[in-house]
């Protein structure tokens, strides 16, 4: 058993049929010696009496809050929650499984630019009584400072019968230093707790492989006198890292026609600017990609040829 | 939300089997942990067992314990009670439960509740 935060306790509990469980000695937080009684929850069924109170937890009926009273006064409480274990796995139903890049990843991040700015994402089927906690640092054993915020929802959309909730966080590098060369991982560490359930998810990453930079702005094309050439011009996402001649991006240039089966021209290009054939109904669109390092492409920013 | 509906009850002799259904409709069915309570008349309402939501796992009270078999088919958003070698003090109204919390015996672990069906064992 541990301590999540002040009168709230977590109870690690490696749970099969017929399991045991854990024995939890429980102690009033009174200087009361005589006199007190204990019970579970909302019931009034008096569990025990003195100033502590042992419970054998085997499955979430045994926790809950606890709570130690003498002569109808409220001493203290202490809430238990369960973090189950089964067949040697800590449990994982809090949150949704989102399979990419691969397989039991439960959180996401990306990282718009080298500055030591991160977001993290997950996704629950649960709308009610979920609350999430988030802690970050660079490196594990020693660890330096990352400050996240309070995780909010951020989305909400409907898949099937299935009402999905997105939650993303915030976090900054205390003392980030975007040019130089990454040796230890972000950790990321998120606390779910829904009812009684405690889980915990974790995410190890570098900043260079979580950039994902924003859309090349003010995308424009000019056409070439007597041709059906465009040339088209676009620049450096406001939240890139710069200056540009070090932290530089290469750029992917597609024409893509009204139907999606139509063949995709594609021109790659460490400019700017690029000249392209612009067909009728055709759309124009370019996306960036850190130039030196394979990271996510951004998404893309589109204008019709016409 | 999500809507159960109990069936299968009936009146069987002692020793004789019985399955009990329940169909789930609304939202994912299994995204839930699923119990089966019961409840005779005058008496409080008493946890059976329960099933995890991938159906792997599965948790009974020790009085049903080698009897009772619970089972679900996330395809069909059902979930089933066997009940063999019923006694009389299995008499009771079942109830079929939606929840989050596995396992728990507890009947405010649940959420969403049926109607219950009717079991009567006769001697």
């Known amino acids: 058993i541990w301590e999540l935060k002040k009168d709230v306790y977590v109870v690690e509990l490696d749970w099969y049929p017929d399991a045991p469980g854990e024995m939890v000695v429980l102690t009033c937080d009174t200087p009361e010696e005589d006199g007190i009684t204990w019970t579970l929850d909302q019931s009034s069924e008096v569990l025990g009496s003195g100033k502590t109170l042992t419970i054998q937890v085997k499955e979430f009926g045994d926790a809950g809050q606890y709570t130690c009273h003498k002569g109808g006064e409220v001493l203290s409480h202490s809430l238990l929650l369960l973090h189950k274990k089964e067949d040697g796995i800590w449990s994982t139903d809090i949150l949704k499984d989102q399979k990419e890049p691969k397989n039991k990843t439960f959180l996401r991040c990306e990282a718009k630019n080298y500055s030591g700015r991160f977001t993290c994402w997950w996704l629950t089927t649960i709308s009610t009584d979920l609350t999430f906690s988030v802690k970050s640092s660079r490196g594990s054993s020693d660890p330096q400072g990352v400050t996240c915020g309070a995780a909010t929802l951020s989305a909400e959309r409907v898949r099937g019968d299935n009402k999905e909730y997105e939650y993303s966080v915030e976090c900054q590098e205390d003392s980030a230093c975007p040019a130089a060369e990454e040796s230890l991982p972000i950790e990321v560490m998120v606390d779910a707790v829904h009812k009684l359930k405690y889980e915990n998810y974790t995410s190890s990453f570098f900043i260079r492989d979580i950039i994902k930079p924003d859309p090349p702005k003010n995308l424009q094309l000019k056409p070439l006198k007597n041709s059906r050439q465009v040339e088209v011009s676009w620049e450096y996402p406001d939240t890139w890292s710069t200056p540009h001649s070090y932290f530089s991006l290469t750029f992917c240039v597609q024409v893509q026609g009204k139907s999606k089966r139509e063949k995709k021209d594609r021109v790659f290009t460490d400019k700017t600017s690029a000249t392209v054939i612009c067909r009728k109904n055709a759309s124009i669109s370019v996306r960036a990609q850190d130039r030196y390092y394979s990271s996510s492409w951004s998404e893309w920013a589109s204008v019709p040829c016409s | 939300e999500v809507q159960l509906v109990e069936s299968g009850g009936g009146v069987v002799r002692a020793g004789e089997s019985l399955r009990l259904s329940c169909a789930a409709s609304?939202?994912?069915?299994?995204?839930?942990?699923m119990g089966w309570f019961r409840q005779a008349p005058g008496t409080e309402r008493e946890f059976v067992g329960s099933?995890?939501?991938?159906?792997?796992?599965?948790y009974y009270a020790d009085s049903v314990k080698g009897r009772f078999t619970i089972s679900r088919d996330n395809a069909k958003n059902t979930v089933y009670l066997q009940m063999s070698s019923l006694k009389p003090e299995d008499t009771a109204v079942y109830y079929c439960?939606?929840?989050?919390?596995?396992?728990?015996?507890?009947?405010?672990?649940?959420?969403?509740w049926g109607q219950g069906t009717q079991v009567t064992v006769s001697s």
């Open positions: 099933i995890n939501r991938r159906g792997s796992s599965t």
């Open positions: 439960a939606a929840g989050w919390l596995y396992p728990s015996s507890r009947s405010r672990d649940y959420d969403y």
């Open positions: 609304g939202r994912s069915f299994s995204n839930y942990e």
